[in-house]
């Protein structure tokens, strides 16, 4: 499947080979189930598409950090 654009419901079987601009990312979820062949991150883009990515890649880690910061509520 081109660019691993199609994220299965629970597992990823291949990863995108293309970095996605962080501005195009809306959210992510981690796939850590032992039933899956590999750990993965599924990003959801602004246009609602899902993409499987390798959590070991720096751009993936940076993107998750960025999204985490966006969703953090300000401390009072």
């Amino acid at each position: 499947q081109p660019d691993a654009i199609n994220a299965p419901v629970t597992c990823c079987y291949n990863f995108t080979n293309r970095k996605i601009s962080v501005q195009r990312l809306a959210s992510y979820r981690r796939i850590t189930s032992s039933k899956c062949p590999k750990e993965a991150v599924i990003f959801k883009t602004i246009v609602a598409k899902e993409i499987c990515a390798d959590p070991k890649q720096k751009w993936v880690q940076d993107s998750m950090d960025h999204l985490d910061k966006q969703t953090q509520t300000p401390k009072t």
């Epitope: 499947q1 081109p2 660019d3 654009i5 199609n6 994220a7 299965p8 419901v9 995108t16 293309r18 996605i20 601009s21 501005q23 195009r24 990312l25 990003f43 883009t45 602004i46 246009v47 609602a48 598409k49 899902e50 993409i51």
Partner: antibody
Framework: QVQLVQSGAEVKKPGASVKVSCKAS????????LHWVRQAPGQGLEWMGW????????NYAQKFQGRVTMTRDTSISTAYMELSRLRSDDTAVYYC??????????????WGQGTLVTVSS | DIQMTQSPSSLSASVGDRVTITCQAS??????LNWYQQKPGKAPKLLIY???NLETGVPSRFSGSGSGTDFTFTISSLQPEDIATYYC?????????FGQGTRLEIK
């Protein structure tokens, strides 16, 4: 070569439903999103939503939520768009269109020939 | 929803003329914009993607430019086969929206 072949023209009465098919060939059906776009007579293009044939995920334009259902049958590489509670202003040519495989982008590199749906009492 | 406004809605030009169509977005869409050509009775055809990239197989007389809210589509030398309606389409966000179209005729 890539082809999207749609079902034939339909005439429906107000309140009825219509189901349009889009048969894909020449590429891996589960590898690309398929969108539905309609065009009323003499009017512009209107996006209705997409289906991800790989996992059956869908995303519908809010305007059509509750009235449209997009499905697929991977065994015959065919996508379907069903629109219910038809009104006269649903009279349009309905197109399926393949979305190039880029996660953050949406552009349509191949289109079906279109299916004219006429809603008339 | 992001509104896309094309101008003019129709235009008439002579073979060999340079033709320009503009598309304005209701908010900043960076370069997330595509252009399509639709001939009468046919499905649309992708010409330009990401504001300025020519789709494979499309003649080089077609070009696109712009970013943010203002975009331009140009035919450098109009050919008889270019008679069609042209649409811009944004994908900055859902829902995907199109301009209302520009109908191009030969004088």
């Amino acid at each position: 070569q890539v082809q999207l072949v749609q079902s034939g023209a339909e005439v429906k009465k107000p309140g009825a439903s219509v189901k349009v098919s889009c048969k894909a060939s020449g590429y891996t059906f589960t590898g690309y999103y398929l969108h539905w776009v309609r065009q009323a007579p003499g009017q512009g293009l209107e996006w209705m939503g997409w289906i991800n044939p790989y996992n059956d995920g869908t995303n519908y334009a809010q305007k059509f939520q509750g009235r449209v259902t997009m499905t697929r049958d991977t065994s015959i590489s065919t996508a379907y768009m069903e629109l219910s509670r038809l009104r006269s202003d649903d009279t349009a040519v309905y197109y399926c269109a393949r979305d190039i495989a880029a996660a953050g982008a949406v552009y349509f590199d191949y289109w079906g020939q279109g299916t004219l749906v006429t809603v008339s009492s | 929803d992001i509104q896309m406004t094309q101008s003019p809605s129709s235009l008439s030009a002579s073979v060999g003329d340079r033709v320009t169509i503009t598309c304005q977005a209701s908010q900043d869409i960076t370069t997330y914009l595509n252009w399509y050509q639709q001939k009468p009775g046919k499905a649309p055809k992708l010409l330009i993607y990401d504001a300025s990239n020519l789709e494979t197989g499309v003649p080089s007389r077609f070009s696109g430019s712009g970013s943010g809210t203002d975009f331009t589509f140009t035919i450098s030398s109009l050919q008889p086969e270019d008679i069609a309606t042209y649409y811009c389409q944004q994908y900055d966000n859902l829902p995907i929206t199109f301009g209302q179209g520009t109908r191009l005729e030969i004088k």
